[in-house]
Interface confidence: low
């Protein structure tokens, strides 16, 4: 199934010449950025990007790798070193501190320098670091957070929270001793630390008092409110803001995003994380692309610009389950959101970055034929004379023994959305990986994204590009299209 034209050297020479021509025409934009968008693919290592590219291409009836993703079209790329101050292989909390605040932290802490210690409440005060989103708000921009996880989850929390424990979602998760020392849960910080204009994702249950039934699952007690302090945080958030609207389903989101009277929007579409894209009820829950579009509609009204954080947060969850199908379909929806945002914004005034917080021990190998299913089998057999999949994990729940040996696998099994790819080491959850991840950039000052950088560089590029603290004396021309 090799395309005939690809057998001809002219095909490759022509294709490369076009790419070279485009590269030669690249002109670094010397203006400041009016808008900042950071797209965060949680757990989206380079192997995930490659595999998702092939899957997306194959969904369009192509062979796969030749069709670029939306993120592939960003002209500038760098590598980001993701380690935490105390760990070679990081978590999503301390990495969020790095790419959102510009300072590295310790494993499982958020919005704190490395002087703060995991789970030690009394090390919080004085060690807070301020996110670029917070700085953008102080500069008069509108700001938004969009995620497929809980809005209180580690990555989105990096935009607004300061906590020594990323798992302190609601006050019920915070030990009494820490509460007495004044440490606040992440949900409380969401509504009180700063004024966020758009908040979209999951995480309803952390906002309401214990015993409050969930509107979508009123008969399931486990999905109801978790708070012990009796607070209704959504109501408090609404009460503080003129023009605030709360929604919990797709229909209400679409209506609110078109309503000119809505100035602040909180949409929480699931009690916890949002459903995987393959399980999403499209009548009730919006997709990441739809949430991104709704956020951009509201944020774009501000003449001073906006900061938007968009997370494909469940790429990571799919990998932790060793279910590549879930991880890759989440990555494709993430890429769709990037594509839609590109249609709704201009690279003349918007700096868009795409990156991952960390990678996963997810591999793609075995010499599969071009055009064969990304979820398929390698052409040959392993030494145990059994088939193996081209996608595998170094560790995780996919390690299973059948009669003391590695089980055989068929193409129909491996193609199932529920299939767990095999791994070398048995773990309840597959782990993150420590290799560098890609950073893709487009728009004003995107040319600064080059080489191999610390993950913290990302936050500094955004701050500099928009002339935010500590780069208010950035000496950049005003963003394209502005008059002041």
């Amino acid at each position: 199934i090799i395309p005939v034209e690809e057998e001809n050297p002219d095909f490759w020479n022509r294709e490369a010449a076009e790419a070279l021509g485009a590269a030669k025409k690249l002109q670094p934009a010397q203006t400041a950025a009016k808008n900042l968008i950071i797209f965060l693919g949680d757990g989206m290592g380079v192997s995930t990007v490659t595999a998702a590219r092939i899957l997306k291409g194959q969904k369009k009836d192509k062979l796969g790798p030749e069709i670029p993703l939306a993120m592939d079209r960003f002209p500038y790329v760098a590598l980001s070193k993701t380690y935490n101050v105390d760990k070679h292989v990081p978590d999503s909390g301390a990495t969020a501190t790095a790419y959102l605040c510009g300072v590295k932290g310790n494993f499982q802490t958020i919005g704190l320098s490395a002087a703060a210690r995991f789970n030690q409440c009394n090390t919080t005060r004085g060690n807070e670091v301020i996110s670029v989103m917070n700085r953008a708000k102080k500069a008069g921009k509108s700001v938004g957070v969009v995620t497929t996880t809980r809005v209180q989850h580690a990555s989105p929390a990096g935009t607004y929270a300061h906590t020594v424990n990323r798992n302190w979602y609601s006050d019920a998760d915070v030990p009494a001793s820490a509460r007495q020392e004044g440490c606040q849960d992440i949900a409380t910080q969401l509504i009180s630390n700063m004024d966020i204009d758009v908040i979209l994702g999951g995480g309803r249950k952390y906002m309401f008092r214990m015993g409050t039934p969930d509107p979508e699952y009123p008969d399931d007690y486990s999905q109801g409110g978790t708070r012990l302090d009796g607070k209704n945080l959504v109501q408090e958030w609404l009460a503080k803001r003129q023009g605030a609207r709360y929604v919990w389903n797709r229909t209400e989101l679409m209506q609110a995003s078109l309503d000119p009277s809505v100035t602040h929007l909180m949409g929480l579409f699931e009690p916890g994380d949002m459903k995987y894209e393959i399980h999403r009820d499209s009548t009730l829950d919006p997709s990441l692309m739809e949430m991104t579009e709704a956020a951009l509609r509201l944020l774009s009204r501000n003449p001073r610009g906006f900061f938007l954080f968009v997370e494909g947060g469940r790429i990571d969850h799919g990998h932790h389950e060793s279910r590549a199908y879930r991880a890759l379909t989440e990555t494709i929806m993430f890429d769709d959101a990037i594509e839609r945002a590109g249609q709704l914004t201009s690279e003349e005034d918007t700096l868009s970055l795409v990156t991952a917080d960390h990678s996963h021990v997810f591999s793609f190998g075995g010499y599969p034929l071009r055009g064969s299913s990304i979820f398929g089998l390698a052409p040959g057999k392993a030494r145990d004379r059994k088939a193996y999949t081209v996608l595998l994990y170094g560790n995780g729940p996919g390690y299973v023994l059948k009669d003391g040996a590695r089980p055989d696998v068929t193409e129909s099994e491996s193609g199932s959305p529920e299939y767990r790819q095999q791994s070398a080491v048995p773990l309840d959850e597959e782990t993150h990986a420590g290799e560098d991840v890609a950073v893709f950039a487009r728009g004003p000052q995107a040319h600064l994204v080059h080489g191999v950088q610390e993950q913290t560089f990302i936050a500094h590029v955004m701050a500099f590009a928009a002339c935010l603290e500590p780069y208010t004396a950035c000496d950049l021309a005003p963003p394209a299209g502005t008059t002041d």
Partner: antibody, heavy 123, light 106 residues
């Protein structure tokens, strides 16, 4: 379980005053907007007054028909809502309900109601 | 002040019928409308809030729709226990109730 119990109603002469109480239980009283609504015999519902929650400094609002005569207040330590009614008129005869804002997300929609207390203004 | 005009003031329908009540606001209320059911001698009961959101525990035969100034409340298949008076409430700008619709069985 959310419970609202009104009391203080009864027969009162025109021009006199009366104070209604609404004792709340089963929820964190300070977190919720509270309102008074009345219903004259055989008539529809009429909203009278609102007192907001702790997050908004317990600010108050009134309908034009009672502004200046009625005062809404709350004793947060006892979880009691009050309606002080002065210069009563015969047209104030009604069942008076206290109502609590939504269990859910919009702090203003009236989701929980007491059983009502009857106020009769007559000479 | 926002005024709410509810119609009809009364209606008679048979069990199984589709019943529709409308409320018109004097200005855009941004979908902040709720619908209540009240039976004689009882307090009102919230059925629907924010135009179309069904309060938990309320049967799915009750629904709401609308935007701007025009809103509709529907009972898809009237049941004997639905006999009551129904009120709309706007809560965009403080509160205003509609005049009520008394629903009877034919």
């Amino acid at each position: 379980e959310v419970q609202l119990v009104e009391s203080g109603g009864g027969l009162v002469q025109p021009g006199r005053s009366l104070r209604l109480s609404c004792t709340a239980s089963g929820f964190t009283f300070t977190d919720y907007y509270m309102s008074w609504v009345r219903q004259a015999p055989g008539k529809g519902l009429e909203w009278l007054a609102l007192i907001r929650n702790k997050a908004t400094g317990y600010t108050t609002e009134y309908s034009a028909s009672v502004k200046g005569r009625f005062t809404i207040s709350r004793d947060n330590s006892k979880s009691i809502l009050y309606l002080q009614m002065n210069s009563l008129k015969t047209e104030d005869t009604a069942v008076y309900y206290c109502a609590r804002a939504s269990f859910y997300y919009d702090g203003k929609v009236l989701a929980y109601w007491g059983q009502g207390t009857l106020v009769t203004v007559s000479s | 002040d926002t005024q709410m005009t509810q119609s009809p003031s009364s209606l008679s329908a048979s069990v199984g019928d589709r019943v529709t009540i409308t409320c018109q606001a004097s200005q855009d209320i941004n979908k902040y409308i709720a619908w209540y059911q009240q039976k004689p001698g009882k307090a009102p009961k919230l059925l629907i809030y924010y135009t179309s959101s069904l309060q938990p525990g309320v049967p799915s035969r009750f629904s709401g729709s609308g935007s701007g100034t025009d809103y509709t409340f529907t009972i898809s298949s009237l049941q004997p226990e639905d006999i009551a008076t129904y009120y709309c409430l706007q809560y965009d700008n403080l509160y205003t109730f509609g005049q009520g619709t008394k629903l009877e069985i034919k």
